[in-house]
Amino acid sequence: LTCLGGFASPGPVPPSTALRELIEELVNITQNQKAPLCNGSMVWSINLTAGMYCAALESLINVSGCSAIEKTQRMLSGFCPHKVSAGQFSSLHVRDTKIEVAQFVKDLLLHLKKLFREGQFN
């Protein structure tokens, strides 16, 4: 999970650094998880499609009082061009399945790494 080869580059910090940091934060969360993440809180599952950054934020923003994902919540706001508020539900959600935050984080991490392998990052 920690192998993020290809991210390092000399010179000015590229915009993709933000993405590297998001992936690394998700890795940290999955690796450092001892007790159930966010006390086993459940969030809406999302479609891991083109709107996933906003969808992920929309789902996770409804989890409060969980310091483990606060940084992820802040970071995702940098990837979502739209305003996202707690309690908001747009067409981004499947909204028929709820999963634990820990599983949500793992799914998001795997998808981001898959996109990276496919060369989807500039």
Partner: antibody, heavy 120, light 109 residues
Framework: EVQLVESGGGVVQPGRSLRLSCAAS????????MHWVRQAPGKGLEWVAI????????YYADSVKGRFTISRDNSKNTLYLQMNSLRAEDTAVYYC?????????????WGQGTMVTVSS | EIVLTQSPATLSLSPGERAILSCRAG??????LVWYQQKPGQAPRLLIY???NRATGIPARFSGSGSGTDFTLTISSLEPEDFAVYYC???????????FGQGTKLEIK
């Protein structure tokens, strides 16, 4: 009715500046990411820039980076494109477009466009 | 930057016929592909998002398919109002850079 109306186009000499405006109505402008897209006469579409709902992030096409600046005034429901050091190849119809909430790839609402001609 | 190549450049068909438009990406864009229709003197109109989902108000005769690098827009039975230019478009995952294909002109035979 959801609407975007561009203005500010015209004829300008190379090296000069121009500011385009896009007035939004019929939706909560302050909640949406917005874009500028252009189309040279008889040519295809070219993405120019994106701005976050609150102006916190902005990204540009390489062809305009360092010369164009996208901005917005949410209190006026208006999107702007400041174009400096204009070149002949910037001649195009400029469209503002709303980034669809359901899909970060798709532009669901477009303005009618405003023509910018760069010529000496 | 991911390059999108559309083919054919021009497609000449008659009303009632089936139109198949192709868009090929220089590298995988997963399913993050969008199709637009543009008529002369008008702004583009969103047709298909995520490669295969019809936007609101788009007739069922329009369908999209494909993933990875090869995508297709199919119009099952052409109506007179369908003759226009069609563009495919994608976004790199990060930073957000948007690319359009060069367009396919669908004209009346």
């Amino acid at each position: 009715e959801v609407q975007l109306v561009e203005s500010g186009g015209g004829v300008v000499q190379p090296g000069r500046s121009l500011r385009l405006s896009c007035a939004a109505s019929g939706f909560t402008f302050s909640s949406y990411g917005m874009h500028w897209v252009r189309q040279a006469p008889g040519k295809g579409l070219e993405w120019v820039a994106i701005i976050w709902y609150d102006g916190s992030n902005k990204y540009y096409a390489d062809s305009v980076k360092g010369r164009f600046t996208i901005s917005r005034d949410n209190s006026k429901n208006t999107l702007y494109l400041q174009m400096n050091s204009l070149r002949a190849e910037d001649t195009a119809v400029y469209y503002c477009a709303r980034l669809w909430f359901g899909d970060l790839d798709a532009f669901d609402i477009w303005g009618q466009g405003t023509m910018v001609t760069v010529s000496s | 930057e991911i390059v999108l190549t559309q083919s054919p450049a021009t497609l000449s068909l008659s009303p009632g016929e089936r139109a198949i438009l192709s868009c090929r990406a220089g590298q995988s864009v997963s399913s993050y592909l969008v199709w637009y229709q543009q008529k002369p003197g008008q702004a583009p109109r969103l047709l298909i998002y995520d490669a295969s989902n019809r936007a609101t108000g788009i007739p069922a005769r329009f369908s999209g398919s494909g993933s990875g690098t090869d995508f297709t827009l199919t119009i099952s039975s052409l109506e007179p109002e369908d003759f226009a230019v069609y563009y495919c478009q994608q976004r790199s995952s990060w930073p957000p850079v948007y690319t359009f294909g060069q367009g396919t002109k669908l004209e009346i035979k």
